[in-house]
């Protein structure tokens, strides 16, 4: 396993809809033709799985079903979105990229973005 | 010039298995998923899953879950969608597509189960 | 699963006509990729990222949308458009494509 460079920014405040978008960059030693993309969560000391997926030559990232992400990606950069988010969701978010194939394999750790979500005010009610 | 060639039609007993091969030519063979798909006589398009040839990651749609296993062979550049515990219902033609645009397509292998 | 809804089901037009195929997600996608499928044949790739033609495919197709709804157009309908359209969606697994349309000569 080798180590790999990925970039990814610092701080990130979500939409008021609970949307957050992020870059997430790899310095790849080589043409991977087989990539896989994690995003993880770190709140607490505890690390989980947001999201993953494998993509190839297409420049959109297909996740699982009921994925709270959509992707896309162009070159060695993938463009992600959580979607979903509520202020308890706050926290760091990691990008994990594996290149898969061709050997050899190499691992990529960012050091996270942390999004920050603030959940709506309720509108108040109106008098006409 | 990119072609995929598929393996022959076949006649299966229910309860059976098919292995269908999907050889591919005139391109990098592990830089592009093998995606299978399936259509019923008179039916639409129904995606069983896919291959990425280099790693041999797989995919599957959970209604094939099971019952369908995908491989493939570098060395030949082939690849192999495996459907097992066959019924009637699988009575289709079986289509191997490349790519994430599904931009090729074999002309399909033509599997009839049949008691 | 994300189910793709199009319509039409069956559309009868006539050469020269300007005719609009809908596909319709139940949820939000990324990308909608359409296919032409002729009988006898295997489908072939007409659009795909919603509004880029594939290699050799005629300017008188075009696609459009976003979210969950899309459309595909022919400008002016020829002889060799007359056959059955899919859509189909990757944003997530499985993978789904639409019921079909076909368009018949009227």
């Known amino acids: 396993c080798k180590a790999m460079h990925v970039a990814q920014p610092a701080v990130v405040l979500a939409s008021s809809r609970g949307i957050a978008s992020f870059v997430c960059e790899y310095a790849s030693p080589g043409k991977a033709t087989e990539v896989r993309v994690t995003v993880l969560r770190q709140a607490d000391s505890q690390v989980t799985e947001v999201c993953a997926a494998t993509y190839m030559m297409g420049n959109e990232l297909t996740f699982l079903d009921d994925s709270i992400c959509t992707g896309t990606s162009s070159g060695n950069q993938v463009n992600l979105t959580i979607q979903g988010l509520r202020a308890m969701d706050t926290g760091l978010y990691i990008c994990k990229v594996e290149l898969m194939y061709p050997p050899p394999y190499y691992l990529g750790i960012g050091n996270g973005t942390q999004i920050y979500v603030i959940d709506p005010e309720p509108c108040p009610d109106s008098d006409f | 010039q990119v072609h995929l060639v598929q393996s022959g039609a076949e006649v299966k007993k229910p309860g059976a298995s098919v292995k269908v091969s999907c050889k591919a030519s005139?391109?990098?063979?592990?830089s592009y998923w093998i995606n299978w798909v399936k259509q019923a006589p008179g039916q639409g398009l129904e995606w069983?899953?896919?291959?990425?040839?280099?790693?041999?990651?797989?995919y599957y749609n959970e209604m094939f879950t099971g019952r369908v296993t995908m491989t493939r062979d570098t060395s030949t550049s082939t690849a192999y969608m495996e459907l097992s515990s066959l019924r009637s219902e699988d009575t289709a033609v079986y289509y191997c597509a490349r790519g994430d645009y599904f931009d090729y397509w074999d002309q399909g292998t033509m599997v009839t189960v049949s008691s | 699963d994300i189910q793709l809804t199009q319509s039409p089901s069956f559309l009868s037009a006539s050469v020269g006509d300007r005719v609009t195929i809908t596909c319709s997600a139940s949820k939000s996608v990324s990308y909608i990729h359409w296919y032409q499928q002729k009988p006898g044949k295997a489908p072939k790739l007409l659009i795909y990222d919603t509004s880029t033609l594939a290699s050799g495919v005629p300017s008188r197709f075009s696609g459009s949308g976003s979210g969950p709804e899309y459309t595909l157009t022919i400008s002016s309908l020829q002889p060799e458009d007359f056959a059955t359209y899919y859509c189909q969606q990757r944003t997530t697994y499985p993978l789904t494509f639409g019921g079909g349309t076909k368009l018949e000569i009227k």
């Open positions: 069983m899953g896919r291959i990425a040839p280099g790693s041999g990651t797989t």
């Open positions: 005139g391109y990098t063979f592990t």
